[in-house]
Amino acid sequence: LVVTPPGPELVLNVSSTFVLTCSGSAPVVWERMSQEPPQEMAKAQDGTFSSVLTLTNLTGLDTGEYFCTHNDSRGLETDERKRLYIFVPDPTVGFLPNDAEELFIFLTEITEITIPCRVTDPQLVVTLHEKKGDVALPVPYDHQRGFSGIFEDRSYICKTTIGDREVDSDAYYVYRLQVSSINVSVNAVQTVVRQGENITLMCIVIGNEVVNFEWTYPRKESGRLVEPVTDFLLDMPYHIRSILHIPSAELEDSGTYTCNVTESVNDHQDEKAINITVVESGYVRLLGEVGTLQFAELHRSRTLQVVFEAYPPPTVLWFKDNRTLGDSSAGEIALSTRNVSETRYVSELTLVRVKVAEAGHYTMRAFHEDAEVQLSFQLQINVPVRVLELSESHPDSGEQTVRCRGRGMPQPNIIWSACRDLKRCPRELPPTLLGNSSEEESQLETNVTYWEEEQEFEVVSTLRLQHVDRPLSVRCTLRNAVGQDTQEVIVVPHSLPFKV
C-alpha cells in the first residue's frame, strides 16, 4: 500500500480542502472511524488499484485517524493497513467529542490504560487532573491518543488553554471491575404452586461485579415475556440476584426454568435450572404404610410417625377415641409436625412413659381447603408379664397341685418345667418340660381372662402331679412379646415331714 502524502502525521488548515490517495495491487479503501467515507476508486491500466479521499471544508472535527486498507476478505497483515493521523487545529473545538462508552474505562486487573482526551492542535499543552483537583498529574500525553498510564479508580478530566480560554474535557471514569469464574445457584420460593398463585425464582451469582442474566421459562416460549429484576445484595461483596416473578401462575407455567449468567469481560458463563409444578388444586397424600395395629410398651416412651406430602401446608390434628389431642402440660404427650422438604411432612405423636389408659383408637388428620387425608390405628399397650403367684397344695385326693397365676399383654404363654435332681438343676441338667402327656404323670389346666379396665390378660394354670416320690423343683415361666418372668417352688412327697 502506498499513501500520499505519506504522513504519518499531517497538520492541515481549518476550512481547507485536502486530497488523500492510496494505491495497491488489490482494491483499496479509506476508512474513518470504522466507516467508509465517500471516495473515488479506480483501476489503472497497469492493474494498480487506487482510492482518492477528498476532504473539503476541514474543521477540527476532522482530526483523527485515517486508514487505508485492502478492500477484500484476506487477512490484514501490517503492511496491508496504513495509518495516517490528521490534525486540523480549530480554536472553536476544544476536546474532540467522545462516545459515551469512551468516558467509562473498565478494567479487570492493574494494567496500563489510556484516557482518550484529544485536541485538534498538536501544539497545545494538555494536562490531566483528578476531577476535583487542580494539581496536574505526572502522566505522559500523546496528542494522537491521550494520557496513558496506570490509574486508580476515580474520575479524571483533561485541561488545555486555547488562546486565553481554559477548556475542560468531559470527565472520564476509571473503574476496576471484579471478575471471576461464574457459579450460579437457582432457587424458588416454592417449586409447587396452585394455579393463580405466584411463581418467584431467584438466581444468585457471587464474585462478579457486572453480569448479564438471561432466563428461559415455559411462558417465554409462547412469547409472553416477564421482566426480571436484578438486585445487588449488600450482605457480602459482589452478590447479585436476579428475581423472576410470574404472578397468577397457569398450568402451562409448569416446566423447567433456567437462569443463564454471562460475564462479558472474560466470557465466563454458567447456568442452572429448576423445575416448577403448577397444580390445579392442593393435595394431601400419605406416603408409606402404617399398620392398623400399633404397639407400645408400658412405662416406655413411644413415637408414632406418619409421613405425607401436601401443598399448601396443611393443618394436622391428632385424635384419640375421637377426642382432639394437644401437647399435655404434664409432658405426657408431645405432638409435632415438621416440614422435611418443601412438600413432605412428618407428623409425630410421642407418648412419654406410656400408661395403660393410653391404649385406644388414634387418628391423624391432615387437611387444608383443597384436600384432606386421615389415618387411623389401634394402639395396644404391651405389658411385660409378671408371675403374681406360684403355690403348691395337696388336696385329699392324694395328688399334688401347683397353681401359677400371672398377667401381661399380649396374652402370656405359660411353660411348666420340673427338675428332679436338685443338686444338678438347672445348671447341669435342663429342666423337663411338663404338659398333659400321661408319661409325665401330670395334668395341666389353664384359664385365660381379659381384664378390660387394666387392658391385660390374666393366666391361671394348675399343674396336677400324680405321685411325687422325691423332692421336685417345679418352675412356672410366663412369656409374651415383651418379656418373661419365672418363679419356682419345691414340691416334696407326702411322706417327707418338711418342704423347702
Epitope: 479508580d153 471484579q178 436484578t230 445487588f232 445484595l233 449488600l234 450482605d235 461483596p237 459482589y238 440476584r241
Partner: antibody
Framework: QVQLVESGGGFVQPGGSLRLSCAAS????????MSWVRQAPGKGLEWVSA????????YYADSVKGRFTISRDTSKNMLYLQMNSLRAEDTAVYYC???????????WGQGTLVTVSS | DIQLTQSPDSLAVSLGERATINCKSS????????????LVWYQQKPGQPPKPLIY???TRESGVPDRFSGSGSGTDFTLTINSLQAEDVAVYYC?????????FGQGTKVEIK
C-alpha cells in the same frame, strides 16, 4: 450535583412513631444503595439500615430490627425510615447516605434530629 | 458482625507534625480475588456530616489533599495525616462496607497540641 435532604425529625415520646424522609437528586436513584446512619449527641456514628438499588432488598442493625422499616419511592427519588416503638436511646441526628453497591458512603445529607423523651 | 476498634481515642499533634490513627477489624475486610479492602476513612467536623477521605483503604477521594494517606492489610488499617494543618482538627472514623451490618470505629478526635 448530588443532593440528599432529610426531613421529618422532631420530638416524640417513648413508644411513639416518626417517619423520616430523604429527598435525593443529582444521580440515578436506583443505581445506588441508600442507608440511614445516626449519631447520638456527642457520640459516634451508627449504621441503622440500608436498601439496595434496583431490587430494594433491606438490611437493619440489630438495635432497630423489628421497629424500623426502610423503604423508598423510586418515582419520587425519596428514601424513608419509618420508626416505631421509639426509645430514649434512639435520640440522634439521622443522616441519609448514598453508596455505590459494595462501595463507601460517598454523599451524605445534613441530617435531621430525632429526640425521644418523656 | 465485624467490629472495628480505633486507637487512640484522641490525639494531640503539633502543626506540621504527623498524625497516625489505627483501625483494627475483628475479621478481614479484604476481598481476595481483587485485593480490594472494603474500608473507608471519614472526617467529621462539628455540626457537619462525615466526609469521605480515603476509600478502598488507600484510595484518596478526589479533592482530598495528598497529606492524607491510608494503608493496611485485611484487618489492620492506618490513616496518616502528614504535616497536620489547622483545618484537619476533626473526628476521624473508619467504616467497613464489606458486609451488612455496616460498622464504624468509635472515632478518634484529632486536636492541635
Amino acid at each position: 450535583q448530588v443532593q440528599l435532604v432529610e426531613s421529618g425529625g422532631g420530638f416524640v415520646q417513648p413508644g411513639g412513631s416518626l417517619r423520616l424522609s430523604c429527598a435525593a437528586s443529582g444521580f440515578t436513584f436506583t443505581n445506588y444503595a441508600m442507608s440511614w446512619v445516626r449519631q447520638a449527641p456527642g457520640k459516634g456514628l451508627e449504621w441503622v439500615s440500608a436498601i439496595s438499588g434496583v431490587g430494594g432488598s433491606t438490611y437493619y442493625a440489630d438495635s432497630v430490627k423489628g421497629r424500623f422499616t426502610i423503604s423508598r419511592d423510586t418515582s419520587k427519588n425519596m428514601l424513608y425510615l419509618q420508626m416505631n416503638s421509639l426509645r430514649a436511646e434512639d435520640t440522634a441526628v439521622y443522616y441519609c447516605a448514598k453508596a455505590p453497591h459494595w462501595g463507601p458512603f460517598g454523599s451524605w445529607g445534613q441530617g435531621t434530629l430525632v429526640t425521644v423523651s418523656s | 458482625d465485624i467490629q472495628l476498634t480505633q486507637s487512640p481515642d484522641s490525639l494531640a499533634v503539633s502543626l506540621g507534625e504527623r498524625a497516625t490513627i489505627n483501625c483494627k477489624s475483628s475479621q478481614s475486610v479484604l476481598y481476595r480475588s481483587n485485593n480490594k479492602k472494603f474500608l473507608v476513612w471519614y472526617q467529621q467536623k462539628p455540626g457537619q456530616p462525615p466526609k469521605p477521605l480515603i476509600y478502598w483503604a488507600s484510595t484518596r477521594e478526589s479533592g482530598v489533599p495528598d497529606r492524607f494517606s491510608g494503608s493496611g492489610s485485611g484487618t489492620d488499617f492506618t490513616l496518616t495525616i502528614n504535616s497536620l494543618q489547622a483545618e484537619d482538627v476533626a473526628v476521624y472514623y473508619c467504616q467497613q462496607y464489606y458486609s451488612t451490618p455496616y460498622t464504624f470505629g468509635q472515632g478518634t478526635k484529632v486536636e492541635i497540641k
